[in-house]
């Protein structure tokens, strides 16, 4: 099944591997965490993927953290779990959903300037896939802490959303992460329906902006499960 072996390169949302597309002839629209199979005008979603294994929070999506799926479970078996919403219990910042941080064991709303975590001095990409630079330079990127006086602009390499400028989040782009725009009202978003269901999205989207949530578009309620379009909508 999908994601059972990372090196098999069987990746969720393929093709669309991407977490969604615009609706126009010759493309399907997907915001659901399945796989869309293009073929004429018919698309079906397969929802039998496995949770994405991880070693650290940075390997998970913006709305997930890395932990053992069972309380007191085997520390060696960790997967990406859905982030904890406001007022939920937590042990560290990464457990809390974007816009929140862990304070006294509870996820609370963070102010704009709250830094969600220490920045590692070095980014190393730990996936089994080859990622060569187009100019042949080293893959290892050392980040000077001085760089972080100015937050990352769109397209900058990042480790987490706090590395990015206001209005941007840190989202996966192939086997790296870059700053991408936080989604605005009406934009297509990716809804992860099950805890740990998210897997590895090669072209990951940001989360919806403040005051917005990712919900099924009203005129898509009647559509089949496979074609339900999620967009950022006012609470």
């Amino acid at each position: 099944t999908l994601n059972s072996v990372l090196n098999s390169n069987a990746i969720k949302n393929l093709p669309p591997p991407l977490g969604g597309a615009a609706g126009h002839p010759g493309s399907a629209v997907s915001a659901a965490p399945g796989i869309l199979y293009p073929g004429g005008n018919k698309y079906q979603t397969i929802d039998n993927y496995q949770p994405y294994p991880c070693a650290e929070d940075e390997e998970c999506g913006t709305d997930e953290y890395c932990a053992s799926p069972t309380r007191g479970g085997d520390a060696g078996v960790q997967i990406c779990l859905a982030c904890r919403k406001r007022r939920k219990r937590c042990m560290r910042h990464a457990m809390c959903c974007p816009g929140n941080y862990c304070k006294n064991g509870i996820c609370v709303s963070s102010d704009q300037n709250h830094f969600r975590g220490e920045i590692e001095e070095t980014i190393t990409e730990s996936f089994g896939n080859d990622h060569s630079t187009l100019d042949g330079y080293s893959r290892r990127t050392t980040l000077s802490s001085k760089m972080y006086h100015t937050k990352g602009q769109e397209g900058s390499v990042c480790l987490r959303s706090s590395d990015c400028a206001s209005g941007l989040c840190c989202a996966r782009h192939f086997w790296s992460k870059i700053c991408k725009p936080v989604l605005k009202e009406g934009q297509v978003c990716t809804k992860h329906r099950r805890k740990g269901s998210h897997g590895l999205e090669i072209f990951q989207r940001c989360y919806c902006g403040e005051g917005l949530s990712c919900r099924i578009q009203k005129d898509h309620h009647q559509a089949s499960n496979s074609s339900r379009l999620h967009t950022c909508q006012r609470h």
Partner: nanobody, 117 residues
Framework: EVQLVESGGGLVQAGGSLRLSCAAS????????MGWFRQAPGKEHEFVAG????????YYADSVKGRFTISGDNAKNTVYLQMNSLKPEDTAVYYC??????????WGQGTQVTVSS
């Protein structure tokens, strides 16, 4: 809206070569990068190769490393996949996909590649 059109697929003998092209039209936003994916009959989709305009990097699946080369021109909205030393197990429909900065992702209809032994 962005439309992706793949070409260059076909029937080739094992050990042969093919060059796939993918042209994007209608782009109004910048693209972060493009990639090639494939689906063989009865199998799941898999990532083949990708190119990030943003980071200036290329990415390959282990199964094609050293045989396939992705290249492209962001200004011309085009990406290529040079496939050498083709094997029967490379037989699949190959799809081109694009990650756009407008939060939409697009892909083409696919092109069939058949490698005979």
């Amino acid at each position: 809206e962005v439309q992706l059109v793949e070409s260059g697929g076909g029937l080739v003998q094992a050990g042969g070569s093919l060059r796939l092209s993918c042209a994007a039209s209608g782009r109004t936003f910048s693209s972060y990068g493009m990639g090639w994916f494939r689906q063989a009959p009865g199998k799941e989709h898999e990532f083949v190769a990708g190119i990030s305009w943003t980071l200036g990097r290329t990415y390959y699946a282990d199964s094609v490393k050293g045989r396939f080369t992705i290249s492209g021109d962001n200004a011309k909205n085009t990406v290529y996949l040079q496939m050498n030393s083709l094997k029967p197990e490379d037989t699949a429909v190959y799809y081109c996909a694009s990650n756009e900065s407008d939060a939409y992702n697009y892909w083409g209809q696919g092109t069939q590649v058949t490698v005979s032994s």
